[in-house]
């Protein structure tokens, strides 16, 4: 009877991009008082772990600690809640969470086509490139949960590049990019050096990111 209860949430602390040998904690939680959580990992081996739910302040949760991250533990995870001892009566699955191991290959370069300081409203494009034949590039912005991704294309100078059009500049931020190969989607390169994009100009035209608190001053906003 899958889906008897609404789906739990699945989070990664400190985040879903994990360096080799570092610690990551996967947390299943819900406002339904689940007795158990099932943590399922898709991949070459399909693995399911049964975790005992802890109840505090109207929330049930369970933590799965990976003390040392390896390539073998990367993959797509989902969490299910169970209110009985039967493993067959489980909730709907949580949204999938991709746990990615980073730092495996050489870092790409990240640059802003018009330079790192732009006028408010100006179109911004960030370019990620490398001599490594990456199939895909992933662009992350500090403070945002999800990365943008684009396929890499070969350039005449022997590099593989992707150009990320960010649209009209409204707010600054710190960006990083990663490269990956088609056959190994959960294994990414080292991070590029961070790129701080600054937006200058009339602050009234400057809209904050949904994940960034509004600035109360007229100064340009920078994410460090």
């Amino acid at each position: 009877h899958e889906g008897v209860h609404r789906k739990p949430s699945l989070l990664a602390h400190p985040g879903r991009l994990v360096k080799s040998e570092e610690t990551v904690i996967l947390q299943c939680w819900s406002d339904v008082m689940f007795e158990h959580f099932l943590l399922h990992r898709e991949g070459m081996f399909n693995d399911t772990l049964r975790l005992i739910g802890e109840h505090h302040d109207g929330v049930s949760k369970a933590n799965f600690s990976i003390s040392r991250m390896t390539q073998d533990l990367a993959g797509t995870y989902r969490c299910y809640g169970s209110v009985t001892h039967s493993p067959y009566q489980v909730s709907a699955p949580s949204d999938p969470l991709d746990i990615v191991i980073i730092g495996l290959y050489e870092k790409p370069s990240l640059s802003a086509q018009l330079g790192p300081t732009v006028l408010a409203g100006e179109n911004v494009t960030l370019s990620c490139s490398s001599r490594s034949s990456y199939d895909m590039y992933h662009l992350s912005r500090e403070g945002e949960a999800h990365e943008r991704r684009l396929p890499a294309g070969p350039k005449v100078n022997g590099t593989f590049q992707a150009d990320f059009p960010l649209g009209p500049a409204t707010h600054g931020g710190t960006y990083r990019c990663f490269g990956s190969f088609h056959d190994s989607p959960y294994e990414w390169s080292k991070s590029s050096d961070p790129l701080l994009v600054s937006v200058t100009g009339n602050p009234s035209n400057s809209w904050p990111s949904p994940t960034e608190p509004s600035s109360k001053t007229g100064n340009p906003r920078h994410l460090h």
Partner: antibody, heavy 116, light 111 residues
């Protein structure tokens, strides 16, 4: 340096079972998959199944489903492979190997001879 | 019979370049990476190439791997007598949910 050390050679009767151990040292045992691969005399390599110790769920090749049991003991960093209902065709060298996407470290191998 | 097909034998003289092919299908090599292992008689296999073209540390750059479509290839340039061994390709098969190995290729270095 990662090392996988396997138990010694075994001679078994047809119909019996064998349990081979693989002790890991020098790495993070729980976070890496351990697979079992066998090689009959003069033949190629054949994957039997594997386990990621931190999860504890074994995955088996269809050919060996129901006849092989793979387990892992995190407290001793040891993986085990038990093969039941042995027949003469199971005579082979059995290897444990570390890794999920590739096998970067291998045990020295355990020769299992099935003979009446 | 292996689902990944390799030539049973290959040979070359010292200094030559030899290639060993590994043919699969869309459910294995077509969607997953190819690994190559080297095995000397009486010893355990050794990882030679992983993720199609990556070399573990300590493996000479004379060894290289590539993949195209549903086939993989191992190239050995500047062949040396110590390269005489058996070579196996391997790929995960999504349909079978298991690892497949090629039948192996015995490489002979001719004097």
């Amino acid at each position: 340096e990662v090392q996988l050390v396997q138990s010694g050679a075994e001679v078994k009767k047809p119909g019996s079972s064998v349990k081979v151990s693989c002790k890991a040292s020098g790495g993070t045992f729980s976070s890496y998959a351990i697979s079992w691969v066998r090689q009959a005399p003069g033949q190629g390599l054949e994957w039997m199944g594997g386990i990621i110790p931190i999860f504890g769920t074994a995955n088996y090749a269809q050919k060996f489903q129901g006849r092989v049991t793979i387990t892992a003991d995190e407290s001793t960093s040891t993986a085990y492979m038990e093969l039941s209902s042995l027949r003469s065709e199971d005579t082979a060298v059995y290897y444990c190997a570390r890794g999920l996407r590739f096998f970067d470290y291998w045990g020295q191998g355990t020769l299992v001879t099935v003979s009446s | 019979q292996s689902v990944l097909t390799q030539p049973p034998s290959a040979s070359g003289t010292p200094g030559q370049r030899v290639t060993i092919s590994c043919s699969g299908s869309s459910s294995n090599i077509g969607t997953n990476t190819v690994n190559w292992y080297q095995q000397f008689p009486g010893t355990a296999p050794k990882l030679l190439i992983y993720s199609n073209n990556q070399r573990p540390s300590g493996v000479p750059d004379r060894f290289s791997g590539s993949k195209s479509g549903t086939s993989g290839s191992l190239a050995i340039s500047g062949l040396q007598s110590e390269d005489e061994a058996d070579y196996y390709c391997a790929a995960w098969d999504d349909s079978l949910q298991g690892w497949l190995f090629g039948g192996g290729t015995k490489l002979t270095v001719l004097a």
